[in-house]
């Protein structure tokens, strides 16, 4: 028979032969030959390969460096890499999560629209009319101005996006 020019799924062509790829979690030790099947070996501790492959070396699991604010979110297996995330109050600087930065705080006049996670930063929004924020915070939303009317009071000082209204007693002087 003619030597193959293409192989089936999960095979590779070498020396005019179709050899089986190694399954995820295993590395190639020896290509198949006329006399033998492909020889594969499991990846060692702290190593992985996540695809059908012909790699002669497994990849090292990612190290979640605490000095960079990282911690393990999901421990790696022989078939998957370790997934890192950031310590409380920090978030990843990239999708690969190789380092962390402190969550951003929303300045006075801005409130938290979306609280930060291990992988995304705080999202702030300006306080609209009727709302305010007088603190720099990574958690506080814009608060509504106090309703003087419901307290049977009147507005003595208008609110801003950074300050609440100031209520005062009704003026009792009648003409």
């Amino acid at each position: 028979p003619e030597p193959p020019t293409a192989c089936r799924e999960k095979q590779y062509l070498i020396n005019s032969q179709c050899c089986s790829l190694c399954q995820p979690g295993q590395k190639l030790v020896s290509d198949c030959t006329e006399f033998t099947e492909t020889e594969c070996l499991p990846c060692g501790e702290s190593e992985f390969l996540d695809t059908w492959n012909r790699e002669t070396h497994c990849h090292q699991h990612k190290y979640c460096d605490p000095n960079l604010g990282l911690r393990v979110q999901q421990k790696g297996t022989s078939e998957t890499d370790t997934i890192c995330t950031c310590e409380e109050g920090w978030h990843c600087t990239s999708e690969a999560c190789e380092s962390c930065v402190l969550h951003r705080s929303c300045s006075p006049g801005f409130g938290v629209k979306q609280i930060a996670t291990g992988v995304s930063d705080t999202i702030c929004e300006p306080c609209p009319v009727g709302f305010f924020s007088n603190v720099s915070s990574a958690f506080e939303k814009c608060h509504p101005w106090t309703s003087c009317e419901t307290k049977d009071l009147v507005v003595q000082q208008a609110g801003t996006n950074k300050t609440d209204v100031v209520c005062g007693p009704q003026d009792r002087l009648r003409a």
Epitope: S20, V29, D31, E34, F35, T36, E37, T56
Partner: antibody, heavy 115, light 112 residues
């Protein structure tokens, strides 16, 4: 071209050890196992075992596990088989062989165990 | 261990004749990957073995097409369609499906 070079003959006394060599050339040494085969006159060939030069991993015929030790020297592209506690039963022709993209045999080393 | 039994032990032929050698294994040589690792080779006096056929029916490069292999499971045959003088020697079958690899004890092809 692929070549496996073996010394022609070795004469050794009973009880001693001998280290047979197989020098490979013409290909990337670490890419293929080297296997060893024993042939005694009038008897069937016997497969002794093989070694992967990439990592030194071996597979053996259980019958030869305590008789043969397989090693490689990557720097000189040479495979070795050490045979220990030799007796007349070990007198034979020993071939090294490699397969993958063709099959190649050394010329064989004739081992004579005699006092 | 898998026992490989070759018949006949000696096969006298006339040049130009067809020759047929049988090899039987004590268990199936079908590997879990679908391949059958049964091989044939020829050894001439004072020489190393020379492989002819691998995996039942695949000829090695340079092997004339008068050599053909067939069979499956435990029963295998090597045929030489028209024997030439250079074909004389001892033919062996071997299996590499199961460890330890094992060999037949040979069939001597000689002139009648």
């Amino acid at each position: 071209q692929v070549q496996l070079q073996q010394p022609g003959a070795e004469l050794v006394k009973p009880g001693a050890s001998v280290k047979l060599s197989c020098k490979a050339s013409g290909y990337t040494f670490i890419s293929y196992y080297i296997y060893w085969v024993k042939q005694r006159p009038g008897q069937c060939l016997e497969w002794i075992g093989g070694i992967n030069p990439r990592n030194g991993g071996t597979n053996f015929n259980e019958k030869f596990k305590s008789k043969a030790t397989l090693t490689v020297d990557k720097s000189s592209s040479t495979a070795y088989m050490q045979l220990s506690s030799l007796t007349s039963e070990d007198s034979a022709v020993y071939y090294c062989t490699r397969h993958g993209n063709g099959v190649y045999w050394g010329q064989g080393t004739t081992l004579t165990v005699s006092s | 261990d898998v026992v490989m039994t070759q018949t006949p032990l000696s096969l006298p032929v006339s040049l130009g004749d067809q020759a047929s050698i049988s090899c039987r294994s004590s268990q199936s040589l079908l590997h879990s990957n679908g391949n059958t690792y049964l091989h044939w080779y020829l050894q001439k006096p004072g020489q190393s073995p020379n492989h002819l056929i691998y995996q039942v029916s695949n000829r090695f490069s340079g092997v004339p097409d008068r050599f053909s292999g067939s069979g499956s499971g435990t029963d295998f045959t090597l045929k030489i369609s028209r024997v030439e003088a250079e074909d004389l020697g001892v033919y062996f079958c071997s299996q590499t499906t199961h460890v330890p690899w094992t060999f037949g004890c040979g069939t001597k092809l000689e002139i009648k």
